[in-house]
Amino acid sequence: MVKLSILVALLGALLVVASATRWDPDRGSRGSRWDAPSRGDDQCQRQLQRANLRPCEEHIRQRVEKEQEQEQDEYPYIQRGSRGQRPGESDEDQEQRCCNELNRFQNNQRCMCQALQQILQNQSFRFQQDRSQLHQMERELRNLPQNCGFRSPSRCDLSSRTPY
């Protein structure tokens, strides 16, 4: 009887986990593409709030701007370089700090996707309607978990949510 109740409890827990991570491909292009909030979502939101994604934003921004290096000194208005970097900090240091922050999401694919979406949204203001730079940023973001040694979210629609 005890064994049966433990089995039921385990099955119940599995169902909760499964429902918390179910993807809804039919959700509209505005708003989250994941199912309605659950306990898992609340936990993810708390994790996202606690995380400092700034190193990731700066790392991605620098990677994208490096691609556009030929345009560098054309516009004095452009702020670039070490804007979010600590003195003496290399790109590698910044990438490591980013990976350390993403580490908290590595066991939650849905939450990792939301973290990547948040980075994209927070940095999209920088490139605005420059589609080539935005595409480059999406490519860099898709590679980010893998570069950190984590599993990439398999179905993560980065640009589906509207940031502002």
């Epitope: 292009s29 505005r30 345009e71 054309e74 516009y75 208005y77 452009i78 702020q79 994209l120 949204q121 999209s124 203001f125 920088r126 490139f127 605005q128 309607q129 420059d130 589609r131 080539s132 935005l134 640009s159 589906s160 949510r161 509207t162 940031p163 502002y164």
Partner: antibody, heavy 121, light 107 residues
Framework: QVQLVQSGSELKKPGASMKVSCKAS????????MNWVRQAPGQGLEWMGW????????TYAQGFTGRFVFSLDTSVSMAYLQISSLEAGDTAVYFC??????????????WGQGTLVTVSS | DIQMTQSPSSLSASVGDRVTITCRAS??????LAWYQQKPGKAPNLLIY???NLQSGVPSRFSGSGSGTDFTLTISSLQPEDFATYYC?????????FGQGTKVEIK
């Protein structure tokens, strides 16, 4: 709510210069691109280009390089279009339009009311 | 530059008619297409973005379809307030362009 308010109509002589202003409100100005669109009398819409309000970098469409300058004053959420050496062919309504982001990227959901510029001697 | 060609350039229709306007790009633009409505003396009004997404507040009688080079704007049942000029606009390349416009007039 989002609003783009443009400066009033202008009557200019050929060879003169002019500046159209576009005052943005109801959103964070530096988060969205500002586009400029021209419409000559009885004609269609012509995209002139855009300015990145975060970096100040302008992009000009072909046919709008040289005499046309996009600029910003982010402290007052203003975008400007300056045209020098005005010609009769510059007579048109000039619109500013906010560029949308991510899902709606590539479209203009918010427009100024338009500024009529007449170039005549 | 990518050329956008709209057809027809003008059409006459009655209230309640189903109206279809097409827009053809000179090369593939994926789904980077928007549709606008403009009335005389007014700024354009966004109807559809990303080829088929209805802009918030736009009546559901408007719909967009297509991808690649061929796109369609459909008004399922024309209303008196729909008599206007319609423009398509591509944002695939660095330089964006509008179609020449389609004027929808009362028959």
């Amino acid at each position: 709510q989002v609003q783009l308010v443009q400066s009033g109509s202008e009557l200019k002589k050929p060879g003169a210069s002019m500046k159209v202003s576009c005052k943005a409100s109801g959103y964070t100005f530096t988060n969205y691109a500002m586009n400029w669109v021209r419409q000559a009398p009885g004609q269609g819409l012509e995209w002139m280009g855009w300015i990145n309000t975060n970096t100040g970098k302008p992009t000009y469409a072909q046919g709008f390089t040289g005499r046309f300058v996009f600029s910003l004053d982010t402290s007052v959420s203003m975008a400007y279009l300056q045209i020098s050496s005005l010609e009769a062919g510059d007579t048109a309504v000039y619109f500013c339009a906010r560029g949308e982001s991510l899902a709606a990227l590539g479209s203009f959901a918010y427009w100024g009311q338009g500024t009529l510029v007449t170039v005549s001697s | 530059d990518i050329q956008m060609t709209q057809s027809p350039s003008s059409l006459s229709a009655s209230v309640g008619d189903r109206v279809t306007i097409t827009c053809r790009a000179s090369q593939s633009i994926n789904s980077y297409l928007a549709w606008y409505q403009q009335k005389p003396g007014k700024a354009p009004n966004l109807l559809i973005y990303a080829a088929s997404n209805l802009q918030s507040g736009v009546p559901s009688r408007f719909s967009g379809s297509g991808s690649g080079t061929d796109f369609t704007l459909t008004i399922s049942s024309l209303q008196p307030e729909d008599f206007a000029t319609y423009y398509c606009q591509q944002s695939s390349s660095t330089f964006w362009t509008f179609g020449q416009g389609t004027k929808v007039e009362i028959k």
